[in-house]
């Protein structure tokens, strides 16, 4: 608590301006009216207050708005936002995308702080879903944002928002997240023609099932090896040598360099060596000729 003291004569602040940096903490507390501060918050950002002085200003706003700041104040917090705790932010009701952008700008170029994470959470919950504009904004500031969400949270992303997602936004997503995002992407891009569709869906294919990969193999898509290596192993295993050859097109030669890595390694183990030899890549490890392949998973299902 800052002790209450009378404002010295002639020091009462008539506006929020740069002269206030010369005020001691107790003078700020005594001479700056909280309501004046609230209406002129936008000016604070241009004034080099010390952290101690900012603490006083925050304290004044907290006293004025014990239930949480109104959005008109929040939008102009500027670097005072860095002084807010997640507990403070949980009291806010942020509905405007402009307010969100203004506060994200303050933290720009830095890791997502607990304050920012809380702010985003409040905003998204208030909207009920991650709409396209919000997703656009969040991924612009934090390309990894989408992959920081749980599969449950991702389920609230409407397919229409998928148009805002860029390939780099999915770089850190794990298979569980792509499992949720892929069907949404498939729905979002369903009206596109073959080659355009593939360009858009490519980043999401880590969540694609076998039947969709088989379908793609019929469309001359020429999938690159980097994309192939991110496919689900369980989705790749049932693909035939011919299907993989069609799926990769000219990139099929890259399998040799990846033969010791999943999913290529596991896929090779499932193929007949005869079939692998038709690729002419020298892939080894397939099932020798004359061996019978038992699908034990099928057998278990029948027993």
């Amino acid at each position: 608590e800052v002790e209450k003291t009378a404002c010295p004569s002639g020091k009462k602040a008539r506006e929020i301006d740069e002269s206030l940096i010369f005020y001691k903490k107790w003078e700020l507390e005594a001479c700056v009216d909280a309501a004046l501060l609230a209406t002129q918050m936008d000016r604070v950002n241009a004034i080099p207050f010390t952290y101690e002085q900012l603490d006083v200003l925050k304290h004044k706003l907290d006293e004025l708005y014990p239930q949480g700041y109104p959005e008109s104040v929040i939008q102009h917090l500027g670097y005072l936002f860095l002084k807010m705790s997640p507990e403070d932010i949980r009291k806010w009701n942020v509905t405007s995308l402009e307010t969100l952008k203004a506060l994200l700008e303050v933290n720009k170029g830095h890791e997502m702080s607990p304050q920012v994470a809380t702010l985003i959470d409040r905003f998204v919950k208030g909207r009920g879903q991650l709409d396209k504009d919000t997703l656009d904004t969040l991924t612009a500031f934090y390309p990894g944002y989408l992959c920081s969400l749980s599969p449950e949270e991702l389920s609230s992303v409407p397919p229409s928002s998928i148009w805002a997602v860029r390939p780099q936004d999915l770089d850190t997503c794990d298979p569980r997240q792509l499992d949720v995002l892929y069907p949404k992407a498939r729905l979002a891009f369903q009206n596109m023609n073959g080659s355009e569709y593939f360009v858009k869906i490519q980043s999401f294919l880590g969540g694609a099932p076998t039947e969709d990969l088989k379908a793609l193999s019929q469309q001359n898509v020429s999938m690159d090896l980097a994309t192939f290596m991110k496919l689900r192993t369980d989705a790749v295993l049932p693909l035939t040598v011919a299907e993989v050859q069609k799926l990769l097109g000219p990139h099929v030669e890259g399998l040799k360099a990846e033969e010791r890595h999943r999913p290529v390694r596991d896929w090779i183990l499932r193929q007949r060596q005869d079939d692998l030899d038709t690729l002419g890549l020298g892939l080894q490890g397939g099932i020798p000729n004359g061996y019978l392949v038992l699908d034990l998973s099928m057998q278990e299902a029948l027993s």
């Epitope: 301006d17 740069e18 950002n45 241009a46 004034i47 080099p48 500027g78 670097y79 860095l82 700008e105 303050v106 720009k108 170029g109």
Partner: nanobody, 114 residues
Framework: QVQLVESGGGLVQAGGSLRLSCTTS???????MSWYRQAPGNQREPVAV???????SYADSVKGRFTISRDNARNTVYLQMDSLKPEDTAIYTC?????????WGQGTQVTVSS
């Protein structure tokens, strides 16, 4: 990271003048530029500030003697110090707020002899 380069400090006799300058390399939008000083055994204190609107303000102890100005094209802030007194002796440090973050220079020594 924003780099600040100060110059212009030195030794001067009481009543003399010095002009400090501080240049920043930042491409960020600058909100304000200011000068602080710290005398031996004292806390750092603000001396003068100029905002992005061009408005200025001064500590009572330097009013009428010091003038802060800014060259936006060069991203430079100046502190013209006239009628210097021995009590102005201190390390003068430039401070910039750019894109809502504060950055400090290394400081330049000003010594006023009587």
């Amino acid at each position: 990271q924003v780099q600040l380069v100060e110059s212009g400090g030195g030794l001067v006799q009481a009543g003399g003048s010095l002009r400090l300058s501080c240049t920043t390399s930042t491409t960020f939008s600058i909100n304000s530029m200011s000068w602080y000083r710290q005398a031996p055994g004292n806390q750092r204190e603000p001396v003068a500030v100029i905002t992005n609107r061009g408005t200025t303000s001064y500590a009572d102890s330097v009013k009428g003697r010091f003038t802060i100005s800014r060259d936006n094209a060069r991203n430079t802030v100046y502190l013209q110090m006239d009628s210097l007194k021995p009590e102005d002796t201190a390390i003068y440090t430039c401070h910039v707020i750019a894109d809502w973050r504060g950055y400090w220079g290394q400081g330049t020594q000003v010594t006023v002899s009587s």
